[in-house]
Interface confidence: medium
């Protein structure tokens, strides 16, 4: 099956916008928007720090770490209020992602 221009293959995602701003207190705030064509039972999420189609149950129950959102070698830690997760690099640097 041929894809029309701008059409995504089933189960794939692409980054639409990536804004970086406001480097305050050595923190860079990045906002990313993605477009996904997910299969039934899937929903847009993050895997290995990239937009991906993930099991919808993960999103419903806010078990964010089950998406494997961090890079290989990083540790995933759920924020207690379930608003997102942190990825801890081997050197100890922590990157926090919140879902909106």
């Amino acid at each position: 099956q041929f894809l029309k221009e701008g059409q995504l293959a089933a189960g794939t995602c692409e980054i639409v916008t990536l804004d970086r701003c406001c480097n305050k207190n050595r923190r860079t705030i990045a906002r990313q928007t993605a477009r996904c064509a997910c299969r039934k039972g899937q929903i847009a999420g993050t895997t290995r720090a990239r937009p991906a189609c993930v099991d919808a149950r993960i999103i419903k129950t806010k078990q964010w770490c089950d998406m494997l959102p961090c890079l290989e070698g990083e540790g995933c830690d759920l924020l207690i209020n379930r608003s997102g997760w942190t990825c801890t690099q081997p050197g100890g640097r922590i990157k926090t992602t919140t879902v909106s």
Partner: antibody, heavy 122, light 110 residues
Framework: AVTLDESGGGLQTPGGALSLVCKAS????????MGWVRQAPGKGLEWVGV????????SYGSAVKGRATISRDNGQSTVRLQLNNLRAEDTGTYFC???????????????WGHGTEVIVSS | ALTQPSSVSANPGETVKITCSGG??????YGWYQQKSPSSAPLTVI????KRPSDIPSRFSGSKSGSTHTLTITGVQAEDEAVYFC??????????????FGAGTTLTVL
Amino acid sequence: AVTLDESGGGLQTPGGALSLVCKASGFTFSSYQMGWVRQAPGKGLEWVGVINKSGSDTSYGSAVKGRATISRDNGQSTVRLQLNNLRAEDTGTYFCAKGSASYITAATIDAWGHGTEVIVSS
Amino acid sequence: ALTQPSSVSANPGETVKITCSGGGSSGYGYGWYQQKSPSSAPLTVIYWNDKRPSDIPSRFSGSKSGSTHTLTITGVQAEDEAVYFCGNDDYSSDSGYVGVFGAGTTLTVL
């Protein structure tokens, strides 16, 4: 085997502070969120609070919010509960609890400590 | 808050069902905790709806139907006599997600 060993309980005075420590062994401590649950004499279980794996995030039950601080030392495999401005209703047994997955909730505790008894009385 | 019966009783070998309903976070499931005496530590018999720790006998199982969760003990034994607490999470704008437990169900083996 997973073991959680609490210490620091005993007789405390109202208005004072207590510090409880839970020493963990038998699992990779830094890979699990941890929490504290307490039980007043003759009563049910009450959520005290939790801490995430890195120690950067905590949450507390309404009865202790503003008075409790939970911290952890992944190098020493310990989690600490500090409770200030003690009241008689803080009397009870305090249990250390381990989450079963990448998070801890009252539905995902898979291991408990033996508990340490705290009595708040003048 | 979570609602569970205050007591249930059964003869050895019978099947016992203890229900738990309520809570604000059914997606995260329910846990069941056994306490044999007021001075002893709880023991997890079921966590995350239906997961059973490796040292818990297979006669203990958990199931969920809607917002009600059921702990089933198939072929109850004398040593199962205890208080059983269910656990879940509730959400409040003040405290966020906070763990909640039922008041406990006393199981008597006749």
